[in-house]
């Protein structure tokens, strides 16, 4: 059977048929259905939704749809003993308490099982002490406090504003600074866009709104009790003291009305500069402690949440490939939400549902993809990417041999301005070519391509006439596939025009106000942006699963490797004397990148010329493309982060959401001037250059002619 025969009709016609079948009205209907009640991981409601999705995917025509369950560590507030923070006077009397829950949005007042705001996996505790305001609690904020301002956070309760970096990194930084508790709050400067009303009259965060979220530092481990292995029926579980990534101090989130009451009394040092001031009418004094009249008052946290091993359920659907059933293209997104999940995740889940329906329609008409497509509805993403990671741990041997690509499908929108794509360089050309074929949904770009509106609104900083495509970081379910297993991965969604606020999320992120109405009234009334995201995600899956030659261009990897090598060399050259003293050379890395570039170029030439009707040669060339991402995996992992194994990319050690290039070298160089043993520190830099150079060279050789 030739590869075209199996698909019945020509690939271009297939793609058009698939895209034409996607309907905005269906996405809208699915979003409504998925958002009427909360679907918190580990709850009966989320189990019922899993079974509903299983049933509907079967109806849509998938070959099989199974539930995959795991028993993982989750965290919940105590229903009878609520979490809150107090201001206490010298007698220990509580003179102010933070809110116990968010005011429910209109129409949802009688909904039960809305989990109150909490920081998942916070330990229990009732610390009391003076407050220190630590800005965003980034690494550089603590450097400013400790090194420049000589403020000691040891034994203090710190209050940090949400935004800029993943909340787990904030907590880790506070712990390292010696804090005994952390209060996280949403400042209007980061979560209230000027000129927009707060919900329910607009998409801004009201003063009573609070961002939930986990505060783990898992570094890719998955379930904290079973790192590296699936949390199945016969799993050996670590004791809680040995669990991976749990915070050691109590943490609690609040809204800006409550934050105002805590911050307005702050005394001590003035903020070091304007970047430490938010938008509240408070002085943003750093502390420690309250000002004169209130100096005897303290802050007390009351945290009673519990960690519990709980069953979670992934839904895994299979559409078997006609020609290469042992090659898997995966589309996955999570199903669990903090509350209603109007954006996160159900705007993504609704899109996946419609993509499955469209593929199912084609299959019912006799079509099959060339390669197998796996669809996944992940559970417990909000608790640390647990569902996807456990499934990948259980199926790692299959995935590392058969995994072609993973496309992530969390929130379809975080704004309605333009497209945002993060992916492996292997997918750059796929994304460019696909978006040139899709219509832009943007006002003022009628009749123009998505590529054109995207490039105009979000231009590449390096290449004129091309759109920005970002590095993959983490904080979502692609992590295990890309950072641990080395499967080419990508994600796409519609975003806001707010580059400076890249990692803060949209104002109502993880609050009770993330409802269907938020999307339908304010973000995407016509669901045209959702449809566009469905076309991008679905189109990528279609091409990856159906093109005869995999749509990966290894030359784009060569380009970025050179860019990343230049960047890390520039960072190192800030220390010219030490580089000379310790004989630090990047020659091996630049040589490896040069070799990679030449070999990739020759491979691409061969890819144009080879006989595509020879199934053995075709499979051989495709395998070289598929395994290229895998070749960047170091089986030993990064220092102290064994599950981050990709040598070219890892989540930043200072912000899980952000991607870092040549992370091993970057971390070895970070703050190197403060290291007590410079010889040892520069020795580690040299070792990391060696690892990177070797890996790039080894990856290049996988593209060489096989014999």
């Amino acid at each position: 059977k030739s590869s075209n025969e199996a698909t019945n009709i020509t690939p271009k016609h297939n793609m058009k048929a698939f895209l034409d079948e996607l309907k905005a009205e269906n996405i809208k209907k699915f979003l409504y259905n998925f958002t009427q009640i909360p679907h918190l991981a580990g709850t009966e409601q989320n189990f019922q939704l899993a079974k509903q999705i299983q049933s509907q995917w079967k109806e849509f025509g998938l070959d099989s749809v199974e539930l995959a369950h795991y028993d993982v560590l989750l965290s919940y507030p105590n229903k009878t003993h609520p979490n809150y923070i107090s201001i206490i006077n010298e007698d220990g009397n509580e003179i102010f308490n933070t809110s116990l829950f968010e005011p429910p949005p209109p129409g949802y007042e009688n909904v039960s099982d809305i989990v109150p705001p909490f920081s998942a996996f916070s330990p229990q505790g009732m610390p009391e002490g003076d407050l220190v305001y630590v800005n965003y609690a980034r690494t550089e904020d603590f450097f400013k406090l400790e090194r420049d301002m000589k403020i000691n956070c040891s034994g203090k309760i710190v209050i940090a504003r949400y935004g800029k970096v993943f909340r787990g990194n904030k907590v880790k930084n506070a712990q390292l600074a010696g804090a005994k508790g952390v209060i996280l709050y949403s400042d209007p400067a980061d979560y209230f866009a000027p000129g927009v009303k707060s919900y329910p009259d607009g998409w801004n965060l009201p003063g009573g709104g609070v961002q939930r979220g986990n505060i783990l530092n898992l570094n890719g481990a998955g379930d904290p009790l079973t790192p590296g292995y699936p949390a199945n029926e016969y799993a050996y579980r670590r004791g809680i003291a040995e669990a991976v990534g749990l915070p050691s101090i109590p943490v609690h989130p609040i809204g800006y009305y409550d934050a105002q009451k805590l911050l307005e009394k702050m005394g001590g040092s003035a903020p070091p500069d304007s970047s430490w001031r938010g938008s509240l009418k408070v002085p943003y004094n750093v502390g420690p402690g309250f000002t004169g009249n209130f100096s005897t008052q303290k802050v007390k946290m009351h945290i009673h949440s519990t960690n519990e091993v709980t069953r979670i359920y992934n839904v895994i659907g299979t559409l078997r490939g006609a020609v290469e059933p042992d090659r898997y293209v995966i589309l996955g997104g999570h199903r669990d939400s903090w509350v209603f999940g109007g954006i996160d995740p159900q705007s993504g889940a609704a899109v996946v549902h419609e993509i499955v329906r469209s593929f199912g329609t084609l299959k019912k008409e006799g079509w099959r993809p060339r390669r197998t497509i796996l669809f996944a509805s992940w559970d417990a993403e909000e608790f640390g990417l647990l569902g996807s990671t456990e499934w990948a741990e259980e199926n790692s041997r299959l995935l590392q041999e058969r995994g072609v690509a993973y496309i992530n499908a969390d929130s379809s929108i975080e704004g309605n301005y333009t497209l945002r794509v993060d992916c492996t360089p292997l997918m750059y050309s796929l994304v460019h070519n696909l978006t040139k074929e899709l219509k832009s949904p943007d006002e003022g770009f009628e009749g123009k391509s998505l590529y054109e509106s995207w490039t105009k609104k979000s231009p590449s900083p390096e290449f004129s006439g091309m759109p920005r495509i970002s590095k993959l970081g983490s904080g979502n379910d692609f992590e295990v596939f890309f950072q641990r297993l080395g499967i080419a991965s990508g994600r796409a969604r519609y975003t806001k025009n707010w580059e400076t606020n890249k990692f803060s999320g949209y104002p109502l992120y993880h609050s009770v106000y993330e409802t269907y109405e938020l999307v339908e009234k304010f973000y995407d009334p016509m669901f045209k942006y959702h449809l566009t995201v469905a076309q991008v995600r679905g189109g990528m899956v279609f091409e990856l699963a159906n093109s005869i030659v995999l749509p990966f261009d290894c030359r784009d990897y060569a380009v970025v490797l050179r860019k990343y090598a230049d960047k890390i060399y520039s960072i190192s050259m800030k220390h010219p004397q030490e580089m000379k003293t310790y004989s630090v050379s990047f020659d091996s890395l630049f040589s490896a990148v040069k070799n990679f570039t030449e070999i990739a170029s020759k491979f691409s030439e061969r890819l144009q010329d080879f006989d595509k009707s020879n199934p053995i040669v075709l499979r051989m060339m495709n395998d070289q493309l598929m395994f290229l991402e895998r070749a960047f995996i170091d089986p030993l992992g990064l220092p102290d982060r064994p599950f981050y194994r990709h040598v070219i990319y890892a989540p930043s050690s200072h912000n899980k959401y952000a991607g870092e290039s040549f992370p091993g070298i970057y971390d070895a160089l970070f703050d190197i001037e403060s290291k007590v043993d410079p010889s040892k520190a520069w020795g580690e830099v040299k070792r990391q250059i060696y690892v990177a150079a070797f890996t790039v060279q080894a990856a290049a050789e996988t593209l060489s002619e096989v014999a």
């Epitope: 809150y84 102010f96 933070t98 809110s99 005011p103 209109p106 009201p206 009573g208 709104g209 009305y257």
Partner: nanobody, 123 residues
Framework: QVQLVESGGGVVQPGRSLRLSCAAS????????MHWVRQAPGKGLEWVAF????????YYADSVKGRFTISRDNSKNTLYLQMNSLRAEDTAVYYC????????????????WGQGTMVTVSS
């Protein structure tokens, strides 16, 4: 439409107790801080008590602190004022009022009032 209806007033002897109720309709009590305010005969308005929407904080005028307790039953959409150790100077028309700020943490301005219920403390 949005309204507040107070009840439970009456004549009571000094030192005795009374419980006022305020039934809210047309809006969910669960989202709003609520106040009790009173007006003694021939006097101006006096703020009495405030409770946040989630009942996490209660604030009282000094004149009633330790004697009056503000509470609510969000499921019944009803606010209460338990008045103990009543005194002659507590004689007034008692109004419940909605705080204008959804989710407010401290007393602010009122945007909706009831028609009031009369409490007379007399031997």
């Amino acid at each position: 439409q949005v309204q507040l209806v107070e009840s439970g007033g009456g004549v009571v002897q000094p030192g005795r107790s009374l419980r006022l109720s305020c039934a809210a309709s047309g809006f969910p009590l669960i989202s709003y801080g609520m106040h009790w305010v009173r007006q003694a005969p021939g006097k101006g308005l006096e703020w009495v008590a405030f409770q946040t929407y989630d009942a996490s904080n209660r604030y009282y005028a000094d004149s009633v602190k330790g004697r009056f307790t503000i509470s609510r039953d969000n499921s019944k959409n009803t606010l209460y004022l338990q008045m103990n150790s009543l005194r002659a100077e507590d004689t007034a028309v008692y109004y419940c009022a909605r705080d204008r700020i959804v989710g407010g943490r401290v007393p602010d301005a009122f945007d909706i009032w009831g028609q009031g219920t009369m409490v007379t403390v007399s031997s």
